[in-house]
Amino acid sequence: GWVWNQFFVPEEMNTTSHHIGQLRSDLDNGNNSFQYKLLGAGAGSTFIIDERTGDIYAIQKLDREERSLYILRAQVIDIATGRAVEPESEFVIKVSDINDNEPKFLDEPYEAIVPEMSPEGTLVIQVTASDADDPSSGNNARLLYSLLQGQPYFSVEPTTGVIRISSKMDRELQDEYWVIIQAKDMIGQPGALSGTTSVLIKLSDVNDNKPIFKESLYRLTVSESAPTGTSIGTIMAYDNDIGENAEMDYSIEEDDSQTFDIITNHETQEGIVILKKKVDFEHQNHYGIRAKVKNHHVPEQLMKYHTEASTTFIKIQVEDVDEPPLFLLPYYVFEVFEETPQGSFVGVVSATDPDNRKSPIRYSITRSKVFNINDNGTITTSNSLDREISAWYNLSITATEKYNIEQISSIPLYVQVLNINDHAPEFSQYYETYVCENAGSGQVIQTISAVDRDESIEEHHFYFNLSVEDTNNSSFTIIDNQDNTAVILTNRTGFNLQEEPVFYISILIADNGIPSLTSTNTLTIHVCDCGDSGSTQTCQYQELVLSMGFKTE
């Protein structure tokens, strides 16, 4: 049978020929009668055999990491007979490992992100090195990890390559770190080989900084003419955090006057001070408000960094604007009796300069020839007034500052002209009527009414009478109806067209004014020839008949 030991050949042997071992048949008595042969991959090129002795040699340098074992076949032949002494047999040559490979980090580049202020022990990343040497051969591939750069902030677990935080880091001081990790084989013993890798560790932001005002004091100005909603200036805080963690909200902490507001421009992160209520320089020209700023998003666990909001004080100076005069009232209503003499007092208006300089005021009345106004605001009549022509005057009073004539204010002035009893009542229309020749006594021939151009505080009341002459002439009589009308009646029977074709009756109408006024009004009565039916046949004036619509035949 075959006799051999297990064959080992160290890798990387530099000698030209290295004896590995001997293949032998136990039938070989050493008289060189057998011939040994080597077959298979590597036979003749990598390995050779001494045909006489069966000694095997490696004639090439071997690399275990390239090939760790060779499977060869051996034959032994009797030289004399040429026949196989033993059956062909397979045998193995193992390439034994030497520490000729350093550890390599295969997953480079390494990059990790970890939140700033993470506590000690927080896992950052695991790095893994690989060693091509034989892990089963001693310590050639047993690795140990260590930190070459990154203390005191990071540490690495020696056997796992797990990188952990060993000291809290503040992104606002440094936002990224390069850590260098070394992997050594031979568990770090002498003669070990090493490899290194760099790990870029970036710190992600957490909201550990509150916003702080750039200035502890701001100065802004606002014109007293500025409308509400006007932006009067900006204030600015800075936050060392980034992104969402730097978003802030401004607000007012103190403003007794409730005159201002602050809104946040979320694009620029500025606070915009706006006017909430109109300001008046003459009332208050200096304001002080305290503003505060807070982050928009603060997780509960980070509230400890945001206990007291940053504040700033804002002084706001109101700028004076020359304002037009201000009337005491929005409009004035005065009363004056008609027929009062020219120069009569009507009323007094008053305007003042609201500004501190208190300019004197000049007054004028627009479009009026009836009234005058002096520099004291006293209004008088410049003509006699007639209520029956104009009962109301709608005017405009203008006040102008003496020191700045461009500063003008106008308000309405209403003057009511009060009535005096200066008009007697008179017929409401022209009355012209007729009486038939055959009219009987007491026949109603006309109802009359009156009007009075005066205004009556109570209802107008008119009194109707015939004049003294007509009272004595008994052809007609009058009855006052007590309702501002009266009826004219015949006071006799029969009239004669030929003798007296027309009567002119004087009627006195008095009003109830104090003093009472009376007018004399003439009623014309035509005598007509009437038929039995009462239809008019002939009157002296055909026009009258026509105008009265009577039939003429």
Epitope: E215, S216, L217, Y218, R219, T221, E254, D256, S257, E282, H283, Q284, N285, H286, Y287, G288, R290, F313, K315
Partner: antibody, heavy 120, light 107 residues
Framework: QVQLQESGPGLVKPSQTLSLTCTVS??????????WSWIRQHPGKGLEWIGY???????YYNPSLKSRVTISVDTSKNQFSLKLSSVTAADTAVYYC????????????WGQGTLVTVSS | EIVLTQSPGTLSLSPGERATLSCRAS???????LAWYQQKPGQAPRLLIY???SRATGIPDRFSGSGSGTDFTLTISRLEPEDFTVYYC????????FGPGTKVDIK
């Protein structure tokens, strides 16, 4: 600590112009948000504010003195000045310069004052 | 302009006593716009209180201010010998005006 020091003639003739300067030390006159005032005190009487100036040159005066007062600022010298024209004996007073506060318009820092007498 | 009236004109008290000084405005002012000053003879006024209850830097806590609208008060809880001097109130809302002063003297 901000300190203010008034300087100028102690005697001015009637109808002339009173001129005083206030020198600021321990702080910049150009500090944002602060106003620099002149205040006077007639002998044995109360205090009267004259006017103030901001480092930009923007000034505001007491309306009762406005027509006679000019306040100016020189940031390079850290000084501000008062000019009061057409003086009369009624302008005899101790004149103080002052700076307002960081939380309001009150007067936080004062100079020690300088007496100006108007007399012929 | 806003006129400030201080009362009493003179207040006679003994050391250790409580002093109450009044300042009245001719029209309502926001409490944030009133200050108190102390002035010793030959010296410039010194800010005591502003806004109207905040003590200025270095002012002892025996000094306190209060009030709103038109009526304001400076209180000195226990008078010390150095407190016997003149006190002025000042409004700084509408321009700047001072009260005529209250003199605190030793009884």
């Amino acid at each position: 600590q901000v300190q203010l020091q008034e300087s100028g003639p102690g005697l001015v003739k009637p109808s002339q112009t009173l001129s005083l300067t206030c020198t600021v030390s321990g702080g910049s006159i150009s500090s944002s948000g602060y106003y620099w005032s002149w205040i006077r005190q007639h002998p044995g009487k109360g205090l009267e504010w004259i006017g103030y100036i901001y480092y930009t040159g923007s000034a505001y005066y007491n309306p009762s003195l406005k027509s006679r007062v000019t306040i100016s600022v020189d940031t390079s010298k850290n000084q501000f000045s008062l000019k009061l024209s057409s003086v009369t004996a009624a302008d005899t007073a101790v004149y103080y310069c002052a700076r307002d506060g960081s939380s309001g318009w009150y007067f936080q820092y004062w100079g020690q004052g300088t007496l100006v007498t108007v007399s012929s | 302009e806003i006129v400030l009236t201080q009362s009493p004109g003179t207040l006679s008290l003994s050391p250790g006593e409580r002093a109450t000084l009044s300042c009245r405005a001719s029209q309502s002012i926001s409490s944030s716009y009133l200050a108190w000053y102390q002035q010793k003879p030959g010296q410039a006024p010194r800010l005591l209180i502003y806004g109207p209850s905040s003590r200025a830097t270095g002012i002892p806590d025996r000094f306190s201010g209060s009030g709103s609208g038109t009526d304001f008060t400076l209180t000195i809880s226990r008078l010390e010998p150095e407190d016997f001097t003149v006190y002025y109130c000042q409004q700084y809302g509408s321009s700047f005006t001072f009260g005529p002063g209250t003199k605190v003297d030793i009884k």
